[in-house]
């Protein structure tokens, strides 16, 4: 007889023991349930201690299920981040390797005496991409200024060029356009490309960070009670075979995860913005085309300077006066050979297209992560009833679950029959993460328009915690920011694991 089997508490004993609890706690037969604090107070197989143990266990199980779901999402975002980051860094490293391999032959000492300047430029581009707080346009402008100074000295070894003369040369530079169109073109294209690449990768970092932080938000005591009632009270009340009614489960988890669901709107905005910015990865100003071809703009610039040398010198003398000549110095340098240019457009490798299409698909898949979480957990982790509605566990007994399913988010839980939710007290950690999502979305939208938003300024917006032949062979003309006093520190969302210190290397 099933009723007598239930009354003997055998099934409860089995389930309770399987969870690792001591069987000595379990009564042999049902007892009166006045002592129960969470489950309905009918006849029961659960003592107070059992109820407390099962309540703690159900709480822990839900937190584990939540963390598991979050971990899957985090892993996906981390894999995406790594893939894109590897690809973008590879493009820049390839460009630098090509420069180091081809420039000595193409430009001789015009390159070797200034190799340090080029190395520094690539280092700064790397730092910028990784999220350092430096101004890319200024970095490029200073690079060209230093390079002009060094190359001008190299091209005129017979002249005495003291600091004040070089200062004058620097002031004339913008009007003289000594490097032709290359600096302007590189500035326009590189700014757009690097801003797009770095903001996309930072977006993945922020998304992952948000998921990690939200997964650590503890479930409140009201949620714990409701989850116990949902999962284990049927056992205590002698109907261990009854599985939770689907709508009942949804209401419990919508109440428990009300704050998390409030991430939905800004989460969608962020993912939409990330998908949108991938449009900027293509074309002549696209990430692949530009980041992989920095060296060709540099080659073009040196060629332009050589072609314009005589005109440039005449204009500099006109603006800055006749410099003194070193009587022991040689004559002016012979015109050097033009560096042979590699084609500017890198043929697309197909790698980026594949990465982008995978990313778009995966980002679309997780767009409704936060609002679908209650449904997902109910169907995947809670062993819901598939029986007809009147045979499932409704929190009181086996039978139909009548209340309507609540809407998503905190405000909609005002009348949640299963979890008492104080809608006037939103969770502060989750509010902070909503702010982080907003900030990153704004950054991506600016990046889409080719603008860089100072990341540190942005992250102060509200949340608190968001989630460094001119002379020496390859020494001269080092582009290091003179004008900007900003110290180049990693930002709130500089790429995870890529701190500024990684820039350290020895030549």
């Amino acid at each position: 007889d099933p009723a007598s089997k239930s009354r003997s508490c055998g099934e409860v004993r089995q389930i309770y023991g399987a969870k690792g609890f001591s069987l000595s706690d379990v009564p042999q037969a049902e007892i009166s349930g006045e002592h129960l604090r969470i489950c309905p107070q009918g006849y029961t197989c659960c003592t107070s201690e059992m109820e407390e143990n099962l309540a703690n266990r159900s709480h822990a199980e839900l937190e584990t299920a939540l963390r598991d779901s979050s971990r899957v999402l985090q892993a996906m975002l981390a894999t995406q981040l790594r893939s894109f980051d590897d690809h973008f860094q590879h493009l820049l490293n390839d460009s630098e390797r090509t420069l180091q391999a081809t420039f000595p032959g193409a430009f001789g000492e015009l390159y070797t005496q200034n190799a340090r300047a080029f190395r520094d430029l690539y280092s700064e581009l790397r730092l910028y991409y990784r999220g350092a707080n430096l101004h890319l346009e200024e970095t490029l402008a200073e690079f060209w200024a230093r390079l002009l100074e060094r190359l001008f000295k190299q091209l005129h070894p017979q002249l005495l060029l003291p600091d004040d003369y070089l200062d004058c040369l620097g002031k004339q530079a913008e009007a003289l356009r000594p490097f032709g169109e290359a600096p302007r073109e590189l500035r326009l294209r590189a700014t757009r490309a690097f801003v797009a690449a770095r903001s996309f990768v930072q977006g993945l970092g922020v998304a992952s960070d948000v998921v990690r932080k939200v997964a650590q938000v503890p479930l409140g005591p009201e949620c714990s009670r409701a989850v116990m009632k949902l999962v284990y009270c049927a056992h205590c009340l002698g109907v261990p075979g009854a599985r939770p009614c689907p709508d009942y489960c949804r209401n419990v988890l919508k109440g428990c995860l009300a704050n998390q669901a409030d991430l939905d709107a800004e989460w969608r905005n962020l993912l939409d913005s990330m998908v949108l910015i991938t449009d900027k990865f293509w074309g002549t100003s696209g990430v692949e085309s530009v980041i992989g071809s920095v060296h060709t703009w540099l080659a073009e610039a040196i060629n332009a300077l050589q072609d314009n040398r005589d005109t440039l010198t005449a204009k500099v003398i006109q603006g800055c006066g006749n410099p003194k000549v070193n009587p022991q110095g040689p004559g002016p340098e012979e015109k050097r050979r033009r560096g042979k240019l590699a084609p500017r457009e890198r043929p697309p490798s197909g790698t980026l297209e594949k990465l982008v299409s995978e990313a778009k698909a995966q980002l679309r898949d997780v767009q409704d992560f936060w609002i679908s979480l209650p449904g997902t957990l109910c169907s995947e982790k809670m062993a819901l009833s598939t029986a007809s509605d009147d045979r499932c566990w409704n929190g009181m007994a086996r039978g139909r679950y009548l209340p309507e399913v609540m809407g998503d988010g905190l405000a909609n839980q005002i009348n949640n029959p299963e979890v008492e939710v104080d809608i006037t007290k939103p969770d502060m950690t989750i509010r902070q993460q909503i702010m982080q999502l907003k900030i990153m979305t704004n950054r991506l939208r600016s990046a889409y328009n080719g603008n860089d938003v100072d990341f540190q300024d942005a992250s102060d917006d509200g949340s608190g915690s968001g989630s460094g032949d001119g002379c020496l062979d390859d020494l001269c003309s080092r582009k290091v920011s003179r004008k900007s006093s900003s110290s180049r520190t990693p930002l709130t969302h500089a790429l995870p694991g890529l701190s500024e210190q990684e820039g350290q290397k020895t030549s």
């Epitope: 460094g468 110290s487 820039g503 030549s507």
Partner: antibody
Framework: QVQLVQSGAEVKKPGASVKVSCKAS????????MHWVRQAPGQGLEWMGE????????TYNQKFKARVTMTRDTSTSTVYMELSSLRSEDTAVYYC????????????WGQGTLVTVSS | NIQMTQSPSSLSASVGDRVTITCQAS??????LNWYQQRPGKAPQLLIY???NLERGVPSRFSGSGFGTDFTLTISSVQPEDFATYYC?????????FGGGTKVEIK
């Protein structure tokens, strides 16, 4: 005005390490390379290496490469030079020196830090 | 490595004398040559950069010349404060190297 202030004198045992600091002020710290030059008692000047405070990139004199590490802290505008496996011949005054304008010309020098290596 | 050879290693002069110090590089260094003065117990001070450019604030009695491998520092009329050690330094290639120094003493 540009100032480079170095840490105080140190006495070390052979085999130990020493870390000398150089705090910069009066200019944009990330704007100029910083070099380290040493001078043994009664001897000439010897270049040890340099660091780009903006990127952290370093170039060392091959002679010291295995033992020297140069780092920087942009938040305090300070560069550091650490020399390990000290021997008696490392007894010297260690100077930090800032470049003039990206050209290997040392226009500004720290006051020097005497490091004595003795058992 | 580029060797820098200074001569003489020391010299004696009286106030008002003209003093010439030479520096020879083991290979062509164009005009990437700098001169420093070091007084006892003090840090070196830049005098001349780029072989012949006078650093701001340095008296005009100091001058530099040369190109390629041979360079000269001249003090046209030595003053009491000029008695010190002088070093040349090449800034053409790594490692940066200094000459052995020339000590200018009072006769």
């Amino acid at each position: 005005q540009v100032q480079l202030v170095q840490s105080g004198a140190e006495v070390k045992k052979p085999g130990a390490s020493v870390k000398v600091s150089c705090k910069a002020s009066g200019y944009t710290f990330t704007g100029y390379y910083m070099h380290w030059v040493r001078q043994a008692p009664g001897q000439g000047l010897e270049w040890m290496g340099e660091i780009n405070p903006s990127t952290g990139d370093t170039t060392y004199n091959q002679k010291f490469k295995a033992r020297v590490t140069m780092t920087r802290d942009t938040s305090t505008s300070t560069v550091y030079m650490e020399l390990s496996s000290l021997r008696s011949e490392d007894t010297a005054v260690y100077y930090c020196a800032r470049e003039k304008r990206d050209d290997g010309v040392f226009a500004y020098w720290g006051q020097g830090t005497l490091v004595t290596v003795s058992s | 490595n580029i060797q820098m050879t200074q001569s003489p290693s020391s010299l004696s002069a009286s106030v008002g004398d003209r003093v010439t110090i030479t520096c020879q590089a083991s290979q062509d260094i164009s005009n990437y040559l700098n001169w420093y003065q070091q007084r006892p117990g003090k840090a070196p001070q830049l005098l001349i950069y780029g072989a012949s450019n006078l650093e701001r604030g340095v008296p005009s009695r100091f001058s530099g010349s040369g190109f390629g491998t041979d360079f000269t520092l001249t003090i046209s009329s030595v003053q009491p404060e000029d008695f010190a050690t002088y070093y040349c330094q090449q800034a053409k290639s790594y490692p940066l190297t200094f000459g052995g120094g020339t000590k200018v003493e009072i006769k």
